[in-house]
């Protein structure tokens, strides 16, 4: 799987999950989140050659098409597969509120 | 929705479904399919700016990150959303066989 275990410990050039830290204030302009100040969101990057973690029948076809037509702009793209939630703390007035923001952290990628 | 109805009748620059015809023999090397000789597979292409048909909370965050960090390589990607099957006919010896190949045609796209 193109997950953090594999991708973070390798120098994989193809589609893989990459490290990305997002600072809520600086990178998103979200000033309302009290904790954490930012988080490791990660992102997906890298080419999707033939057979590289292809998601559907269509992505297999497109990767194969791409191999037969190398100049084509039609190619599968490296996108998130498994996403995880992020617990945050913010204030409603003086009252702290703990919430899970769903689908915030990329754990693995796929070619779609 | 970024579907064929909208995308094929517009000059949309952002993420949208685009026309692509695939010839089984020439483009995939699949010689065994008797009918059709090829099909309109389509593909997804175009930038994914902030708020453009974003798929998950994560893709919203990433698009926003991208807006704050325009030079970053982390950005959502335009990928298939709705896929449809393709009926084919091939011969097993002298006997024709009709089969549905699942997830072969892109009907709409999303930013993931």
């Amino acid at each position: 799987a193109l997950d953090t275990n594999y991708c973070f410990s390798s120098t994989e050039k193809n589609c893989c999950v990459r490290q990305l830290y997002i600072d809520f204030r600086k990178d998103l302009g979200w000033k309302w989140i009290h904790e954490p100040k930012g988080y490791h969101a990660n992102f997906c990057l890298g080419p999707c050659p033939y057979i590289w973690s292809l998601d559907t029948q269509y992505s297999k076809v497109l990767a194969l098409y791409n191999q037969h037509n190398p100049g084509a702009s039609a190619a599968p793209c490296c996108v998130p597969q498994a996403l995880e939630p992020l617990p945050i703390v913010y204030y409603v007035g003086r009252k702290p509120k703990v919430e899970q923001l769903s689908n915030m952290i990329v754990r693995s990628c796929k070619c779609s | 929705a970024l579907d064929t109805n909208y995308c094929f009748s517009s000059t949309e620059k952002n993420c949208c479904v685009r026309q692509l015809y695939i010839d089984f023999r020439k483009d995939l090397g699949w010689k065994w399919i008797h009918e059709p000789k090829g099909y309109h597979a389509n593909f997804c292409l175009g930038p994914c700016p902030y708020i453009w048909s974003l798929d998950t909370q994560y893709s919203k965050v990433l698009a926003l990150y991208n807006q704050h960090n325009p030079g970053a390589s982390a950005a959502p990607c335009c990928v298939p959303q709705a896929l449809e099957p393709l009926p084919i006919v091939y011969y097993v010896g002298r006997k024709p066989k009709v089969e549905q190949l699942s997830n072969m045609i892109v009907r709409s796209c999303k930013c993931s």
Epitope: Y50, I51, Q57, K60, V61, L64, Q67 | L28, G29, W30, K31, W32, Y90, Y91, V92, G93, R94, K95, K97, E99, L101, S102
Partner: antibody, heavy 121, light 111 residues
Framework: QVQLVQSGAEVKKPGASVKVSCKAS????????MNWVRQAPGQGLEWIGQ????????NYNEMFEGRATLTVDTSTSTAYMELSSLRSEDTAVYYC??????????????WGQGTLVTVSS | DIVLTQSPASLAVSPGQRATITCRAS??????????MNWYQQKPGQPPKPLIY???NLESGVPARFSGSGSRTDFTLTINPVEADDTANYYC?????????FGQGTKVEIK
């Protein structure tokens, strides 16, 4: 160059199942049908069935329908043949063999080295 | 299923001589202008090796000493001249109809 490398020999008890693997390299795995053929000791060759890796489309010899299951893992370019409810008559060398690409049923141009499956109580 | 009958079951040939193996199908294997008949060579402990496809087309890398002929139900594999390395079992196979079937094999020995 094209290579099909099969898993090692197996000894199974009657009634059990066996799963043989065939790892392909040197060609585009999802472009060719993969066939499975067996050969009982000192006997002729018998076609079990075939699978098209890109779609998972399968065709089986009626003799093996319901007992043989063909699958693939396209991420590792590996084909699998599982045979269930084994009996002593299933003792044979099992081969994977690539179809040459023109038709579904085709001449088989590359063969694995074979996997001996012995069914014995 | 189409039944393929090979003859002879075995034959011994001297080096430099001609070896002829015949394969008779229980029904025609011709279709789309082709004869769907293939020939394979198998040596002990090895997988079958393709020799001929579509009745008469030589697989790449196969010596021109091997040739195939025939149509409909009657087919022939000829090795001329035979060499010591040709000791093996030879199988015909039809792929005109599912399931593909094989002949029972012909054992060729070099005297």
């Amino acid at each position: 160059q094209v290579q099909l490398v099969q898993s090692g020999a197996e000894v199974k008890k009657p009634g059990a199942s066996v799963k043989v693997s065939c790892k392909a390299s040197g060609y585009i795995f999802i472009t060719y049908w993969m066939n499975w053929v067996r050969q009982a000791p000192g006997q002729g060759l018998e076609w079990i069935g075939q699978i098209f890796p890109a779609s998972g489309s399968t065709n089986y010899n009626e003799m093996f329908e319901g007992r043989a299951t063909l699958t693939v893992d396209t991420s590792t370019s590996t084909a699998y043949m599982e045979l269930s409810s084994l009996r002593s008559e299933d003792t044979a060398v099992y081969y994977c063999a690539r179809g040459d690409g023109n038709y579904a049923l085709d001449a088989m141009d590359y063969w694995g080295q074979g996997t001996l499956v012995t069914v014995s109580s | 299923d189409i039944v393929l009958t090979q003859s002879p079951a075995s034959l011994a040939v001297s080096p430099g001589q001609r070896a002829t193996i015949t394969c008779r199908a229980s029904e025609s294997v011709d279709n789309y202008g082709n004869s769907f008949m293939n020939w394979y060579q198998q040596k002990p402990g090895q997988p079958p090796k393709p020799l001929i496809y579509f009745a008469s087309n030589l697989e790449s890398g196969v010596p021109a000493r091997f040739s195939g002929s025939g149509s409909r139900t009657d087919f022939t594999l000829t090795i001329n001249p035979v060499e010591a390395d040709d000791t093996a079992n030879y199988y015909c196979q039809q792929n005109n109809e599912a399931p593909p079937t094989f002949g029972q094999g012909t054992k060729v020995e070099i005297k």
